[in-house]
């Protein structure tokens, strides 16, 4: 499956929206930095097959959608930007779902990518626990926003690589 150019543009638009969502000076939040343990190995295009990488992207976007759909998130961010962000994520989920089922059958995908999907879920679990521990403070959300931007950037770069390999 060739990920459509629109997916890459959507990813870039999602990143821009995330960048625009910042509300407080990042400099005041340095003490809240945290190692969430981004599962980089899951997205390593050389080590894993394309279907696995796409499956991991899908899980990451789904989990991002879940994270930013909570009532705590709604209270933290600008509603208009958040709505636009949801639309971009929803579009990307549709693109990736089509790609995943095209690459391999649904049953095979579920079995083959269990470990990588679990790694992504655990990563987001760590993010959620961090936010809870910080009582969803503005700085905690800033740190999470920066972390999601970094993971999105990483997956965008890898998607470019996947398209070049086709």
């Amino acid at each position: 499956c060739d990920l459509p150019q629109t997916h890459s543009l959507g990813n870039r638009r999602a990143l821009i929206l995330l960048a625009q969502m910042g509300r407080i000076s990042h400099f005041s939040c340095l003490k809240d930095r945290y190692d969430f343990g981004f599962p980089q190995e899951v997205f390593d295009g050389n080590q894993f097959q394309k279907a696995q990488a796409i499956s991991a992207f899908h899980e990451m976007i789904q989990q991002t959608f879940n994270l930013f759909s909570t009532k705590d998130s709604s209270a933290a961010w600008d509603e208009t930007l958040l709505d636009k962000f949801y639309i971009e994520l929803f579009q990307q989920l549709n693109d990736l779902e089509a790609c995943v089922t095209q690459e391999v059958g649904v049953e095979e995908i579920a079995l083959m990518n269990e470990d990588s999907i679990l790694a992504v879920r655990k990563y987001f679990q760590r993010i959620t626990l961090y936010l809870m521990g910080k009582k969803y403070s503005p700085c905690a959300w800033e740190v999470v926003r920066a972390e999601i931007m970094r993971s999105f950037s990483f997956s965008t770069n890898l998607q470019k690589g996947l398209r070049r390999k086709d």
Partner: antibody, heavy 121, light 107 residues
Framework: EVQLVQSGAEVKKPGESLKISCKGS????????IGWVRQMPGKGLEWMGI????????AYSPSFQGQVTISADKSISTAYLQWSSLKASDTAMYYC??????????????WGQGTLVTVSS | DIQMTQSPSSLSASVGDRVTITCRAS??????LNWYQQKPGKAPKLLIY???SLQSGVPSRFSGSGSGTDFTLTISSLQPEDFATYYC?????????FGQGTKVEIK
């Protein structure tokens, strides 16, 4: 390959203005902050200030607040450090370095080669 | 501002020696501490970040430890290329501040 390339050495007279640069390449310039560090001859490192090139938000050390201005042009992946009126005590080596911002990653992992500023009448 | 105090300010050692440099913060900085190496005429180089994480490409003879206010940089077996000045830096809050430096010289 990640690189921070600084502008060349400068010799200036007291009272003159100056703007030195730091150009980033090999990475997403707006994903990292750029910090500036001063080192006077034979002395230690002094942190001057920092900029987030994504929105040009800046923060300064109290010692340098009002003495220098930090700016960035993300369209050309370049950060700047400028003086409106140099003093002899500004004679030093100035380094730029990148910082991962709020992300958990090595701080100041790449540095520019330094710009030597000499202020003398 | 958070003050960083390094000790000693200089030391003489021989190749193969185990060298320890300490850094003390004026208030708790958790583990937000970095160590840099600087050689004459060169830019500083990051050795250790987050108190104990070894920066990519840095030899394993360098190690860092500590948390709160007291930190240590250890060179397990000093090599000729390790003669330089070492700086600690707190990274928990702005303004970032450096220690005054420790110069490691040949005995």
């Amino acid at each position: 390959e990640v690189q921070l390339v600084q502008s060349g050495a400068e010799v200036k007279k007291p009272g003159e203005s100056l703007k030195i640069s730091c150009k980033g390449s090999g990475y997403s310039f707006t994903s990292y902050w750029i910090g500036w560090v001063r080192q006077m001859p034979g002395k230690g490192l002094e942190w001057m200030g920092i900029i987030d090139p994504s929105d040009s938000d800046t923060a300064y050390s109290p010692s340098f607040q009002g003495q220098v201005t930090i700016s960035a042009d993300k369209s050309i992946s370049t950060a700047y450090l400028q003086w409106s009126s140099l003093k002899a005590s500004d004679t030093a080596m100035y380094y730029c370095a990148r910082h991962p911002g709020l992300n958990w990653a090595p701080d100041f992992d790449y540095w520019g080669q330094g710009t030597l500023v000499t202020v003398s009448s | 501002d958070i003050q960083m105090t390094q000790s000693p300010s200089s030391l003489s050692a021989s190749v193969g020696d185990r060298v320890t440099i300490t850094c003390r913060a004026s208030q708790s900085i958790n583990r937000f501490l970095n160590w840099y190496q600087q050689k004459p005429g060169k830019a500083p180089k990051l050795l250790i970040y987050a108190a104990s994480s070894l920066q990519s490409g840095v030899p394993s003879r360098f190690s860092g430890s500590g948390s709160g206010t007291d930190f240590t940089l250890t060179i397990s077996s000093l090599q000729p290329e390790d003669f330089a000045t070492y700086y600690c830096q707190q990274a928990i809050d702005l303004p970032f501040t450096f220690g005054q430096g420790t110069k490691v010289e040949i005995k």
